[in-house]
């Protein structure tokens, strides 16, 4: 008797976060020789009998969590793990900003700070070349997120997005990049020397942050909170 | 996969250009699939007007968007594109292409057919 | 809307050489890039899709490289039927814009 079935994968190319009108595909991998895949969006009737979901143009309506399944035989296997289709662009761009300043010394502290003007509850912090956001509720219109003991890994490109926690796979568009430079010297600069050129954003390379909150009235808990479950 | 565009040759300026591309080899209900237009002036680079896909989404080109108008007889395997309105500067030859999500290209040509707007 | 843009407008160069046509995009497109090659009175045929991908039938010759907002398309050993116009395109949201094109001669 054969093993129970493995649950296959389900990815977003190039990335689960779409701005609205980009492409984006949906491919749900399992075991060679699957006789059936099932793609479905959560929370709708929505699904369909194959492994490939292309969006020519993202809308807004597409948002929301997928899911996918295959079938050999008569058994179906497990679902795998729920992916976040997230539309960007949906509203207009945070603010990033560091505080003291985007120069910080090896083993110094630092904060960026995502504001928007509108009332959105809700805030993920990037650094190019991570796989996930940091996320952070909190209120008044802007978030927090300390970095403590601050390492030369911490060095990179930021972006912010906002968004509501009613609505949470409709957000922003991206911050301005914030450029992040870690200085060996004893003695960080203030200069504020923020990029505003508009850098690849990739997710190929997996680096961690460490971020905890700071600010009074963010919640208890860490404030990273891997945004793919 | 063949694609043959066919068009009125010669139009005056003010008219409406009604182009057909006809294609065998593929059929415009298979999930993924769509159909294009592009046209290149003599001499000129290649320029997108528009495109259709299987499921009836329609994208045109922002400059010329109000001029076009793109649709397809799927059970006929045809697609059709309108220019109202042209001018010498529409004088070209227009192409139709197949489209293919995976890889998002252009993985098919027509010969083209071209068009000459003069009074 | 997404510029591309290709460079050189125009190469000359012998059988044999190899060349590398480039293309820039104004903003990150992942992938969503091919190139075509054009000969004097036809229609276009595509040469790479998804950047990288050499389509059906084209010879080995040529490959394409890059992601983000750099592409290139290398032919090595350039043959007699090579020559001709190139054009990249992306595919990136609409509108899908092609690069200016890059005439290449027999020196």
């Known amino acids: 008797q054969r093993g129970p079935l493995p649950k296959p994968s389900l990815q977003a190319l190039p990335s689960s976060l779409v701005p609205l009108e980009k492409p984006v595909t949906l491919r749900c991998q399992g075991p060679p020789g699957v006789d059936l895949y099932r793609l479905e969006k959560l929370s709708s009737s929505r699904y369909q009998d194959q492994a490939v979901l292309f969006i020519p143009a993202m809308k807004r309506h597409l948002a929301g969590r997928y899911r996918c399944s295959y079938q050999n035989g008569s058994l179906w296997s497990p679902p795998s793990d729920q992916l976040e289709l997230v539309a960007t662009g949906v509203f207009a761009k945070p603010s990033l900003s560091a505080q003291p300043g985007p120069a910080v010394s090896s083993g110094g502290d630092v904060t960026l700070q995502c504001q928007t003007r509108y009332g959105f509850d809700q805030f993920a912090l990037y650094k190019e070349g991570d796989p996930a956001p940091y996320k952070n509720p909190e209120r008044w219109y802007r978030a927090s997120f300390p970095i403590i003991t601050v390492t030369a890994a911490h060095s990179g490109t930021y972006r912010c997005y906002s968004f509501s926690s009613g609505d949470p796979y409709l957000w922003s568009a991206p911050s301005d990049p914030l450029e992040l430079m870690v200085t060996e010297f004893s003695e960080a600069t203030t200069e504020l020397t923020v990029s505003l050129t508009n850098k690849v954003f990739t997710t190929e390379t997996s680096r961690s942050i460490t971020a905890s909150p700071k600010e009074p009235g963010s919640p208890a808990g860490p404030a990273r909170q891997h945004y793919t479950k | 996969v063949t694609l043959k565009e066919s068009g009125p040759g010669i139009l005056q300026p003010s008219q409406t250009l009604s182009l057909t591309c006809s294609f065998s080899g593929f059929s415009l209900s298979t999930y993924g699939i769509g159909v294009g237009w592009i046209r290149q002036p003599s001499g000129k680079g290649l320029e997108w007007l528009a495109h259709i896909w299987w499921d009836d989404n329609k994208y045109y080109n922002t400059a010329l968007k109000s001029r076009l108008t793109i649709s397809k007889d799927t059970s006929n395997n045809q697609v059709f594109l309108k220019i109202a309105s042209v001018d010498t500067a529409d004088t070209a030859t227009y192409y139709c292409?197949?489209?293919?999500?995976?890889?998002?290209?252009?993985?098919?040509w027509g010969q083209g057919t071209t068009l000459t707007v003069s009074s | 809307d997404i510029q591309m843009t290709q460079s050189p407008a125009s190469l000359s160069a012998s059988v044999g050489e190899t060349v590398t046509i480039t293309c820039r995009a104004s903003e990150n497109i992942y992938s969503y890039l091919a190139w075509y090659q054009q000969k004097q009175g036809k229609s276009p045929h595509l040469l790479v899709y998804?950047?990288?991908n050499l389509a059906d039938g084209v010879p080995s010759r040529f490959s394409g490289s890059g992601s983000g907002t750099q592409f290139s398309l290398k032919i090595n050993s350039l043959q007699p039927e090579d020559f001709g116009s190139y054009y990249c395109?992306?595919?990136?949201?609409?509108?899908?814009?092609f690069g200016g094109g890059t005439k290449l001669e027999i020196k």
């Open positions: 998804a950047a990288t």
């Open positions: 292409a197949r489209i293919h999500y995976y890889g998002s290209s252009l993985d098919y």
């Open positions: 395109q992306h595919f990136y949201g609409t509108p899908w814009t």
